[in-house]
């Protein structure tokens, strides 16, 4: 399983779709900006084994899928782009699950530790609570879209670390 390449290509396609989903100017929503506290340390490529990287990516993508597959999200975005985004996320999830299947035979290392996962989940909880507090306004969704783009970009740090190890 060529994880860095698989994930990198999927990530890029997901980022392009997220960019295309933007409906309103980010500048008109500056008053709604918020620091969600992305757990950057979780995606520090130097501390990862391959199995942990797989589960870190998966966690990020699954939580993003959960966030964007709600009724409120469907109302906020263009349906065609949203479906393409779902397909991209779903494909990445499948690829990552297949990576675990393929890792059998080599010594199976533990998946990502619980603290790291909880940090990612709490980050997404903060995003959900922010959206609820803002009553899922167009600007709130725009802020969240930009935030997810940023967090997807951060995971490239992990890819670089993995490439060095490979």
């Amino acid at each position: 399983c060529d994880l860095p390449q698989t994930h990198s290509l999927g990530n890029r396609r997901a980022l392009i779709l997220l960019a295309q989903m933007g409906r309103i100017s980010h500048f008109s929503c500056l008053k709604d900006r918020y620091d969600f506290g992305f757990p950057q340390e979780v995606f520090d490529g130097n501390q990862f084994q391959k199995a942990q990287a797989i589960s870190a990516f998966h966690e990020m993508i699954q939580q993003t899928f959960n966030l964007f597959s709600t009724k409120d999200s469907s109302a906020a975005w263009d349906e065609t782009l949203l479906d393409k985004f779902y397909i991209e996320l779903f494909q990445q999830l499948n690829d990552l699950e297949a990576c675990v299947t393929q890792e059998v035979g080599v010594e199976e290392i533990a998946l990502m530790n619980e603290d790291s996962i909880l940090a990612v989940r709490k980050y997404f909880q903060r995003i959900t609570l922010y959206l609820m507090g803002k009553k899922y306004s167009p600007c709130a969704w725009e802020v969240v879209r930009a935030e997810i783009m940023r967090s997807f970009s951060f995971s490239t740090n992990l890819q670089k670390g993995l490439r060095r190890k490979d």
């Epitope: 966690e59 597959s69 779903f90």
Partner: antibody, heavy 126, light 110 residues
Framework: EVQLLESGAEVKRPGSSVRVSCRAS????????ISWVRQAPGQGLEWMGR????????NYAQNFRGRITITADKSPLTAYLELSSLRFEDTAVYYC???????????????????WGQGSLVTVSS | EIVLTQSPGTLSLSPGEGATLSCRAS???????LTWYQQKPGQSPRLLIY???SRATGVPDRFSGGGSGTDFTLTISRLEPEDFAVFYC???????????FGQGTKVEIK
């Protein structure tokens, strides 16, 4: 916590079709697959197929291809199993089952069935 | 396609005794993708162990899972009266996603 509620028992003739529904409530996500698993009387569990409601993407077990159709509605989150060309050996309890969003890490979540419906008995009899 | 074979078919034991149930796969399975369920008569299955060795919420610590490759075990350290049931192992393989169950092991009161 997710609750799965299936439709009632059915009696069908050989060669006919049956449609079983499964309504999900609680902490549901259309981004997690819903599966159908059946159990013939006194027998073990057999996975039939699954659907990802957000996309309508389906995967079917080899044994059922050509006879099975799984569909879903996103709101309220409901999955449907349709099995055609029924045979006597299709007499079974049909369960819908789903993963849990709470499983850590999430990569394990879709590989298992954390929540199960109460089961729907389908009897094929002439 | 992976085949899971559980043994023994039936285990007759008394409360307080320990039980070891085996699940053998026809080819290598990731321990992360091996799950155990308990099913009592007239009830739906209940998730017990996932990821090979992690206990599901509310599952007592007398239940433990282990193994890797093709050989997996479910151990019940001291059987309680409510533990007597049928136990199933299940694996997941991708792509395409396929879920496979073992035929079950019945743990009955001696």
């Amino acid at each position: 916590e997710v609750q799965l509620l299936e439709s009632g028992a059915e009696v069908k003739r050989p060669g006919s079709s049956v449609r079983v529904s499964c309504r999900a409530s609680g902490d549901t996500f259309s981004s997690y697959p819903i599966s159908w698993v059946r159990q013939a009387p006194g027998q073990g569990l057999e996975w039939m197929g699954r659907i990802l409601p957000a996309l309508g993407v389906t995967n079917y077990a080899q044994n059922f291809r050509g006879r099975i159709t799984i569909t879903a509605d996103k709101s309220p989150l409901t999955a449907y199993l349709e099995l055609s060309s029924l045979r006597f050996e299709d007499t079974a309890v049909y369960y819908c089952a789903s993963p849990s969003a709470d499983i850590i890490p999430s990569i394990l979540g879709t590989t298992l069935f954390a929540f199960w419906g109460q089961g729907s008995l389908v009897t094929v009899s002439s | 396609e992976i085949v899971l074979t559980q043994s023994p078919g039936t285990l007759s034991l008394s409360p307080g005794e320990g039980a070891t149930l085996s699940c053998r796969a026809s080819q290598n399975v990731s321990r992360h993708y091996l799950t155990w369920y308990q099913q009592k008569p007239g009830q739906s299955p209940r998730l017990l162990i996932y990821g090979g060795s992690s206990r599901a919420t509310g599952v007592p610590d007398r239940f433990s899972g282990g193994g890797s490759g093709t050989d997996f075990t479910l151990t019940i350290s001291r059987l309680e009266p409510e533990d007597f049931a049928v136990f199933y192992c299940q694996s997941y393989h991708s792509p395409p996603p396929v879920y496979t169950f073992g035929q079950g092991t019945k743990v009955e009161i001696k």
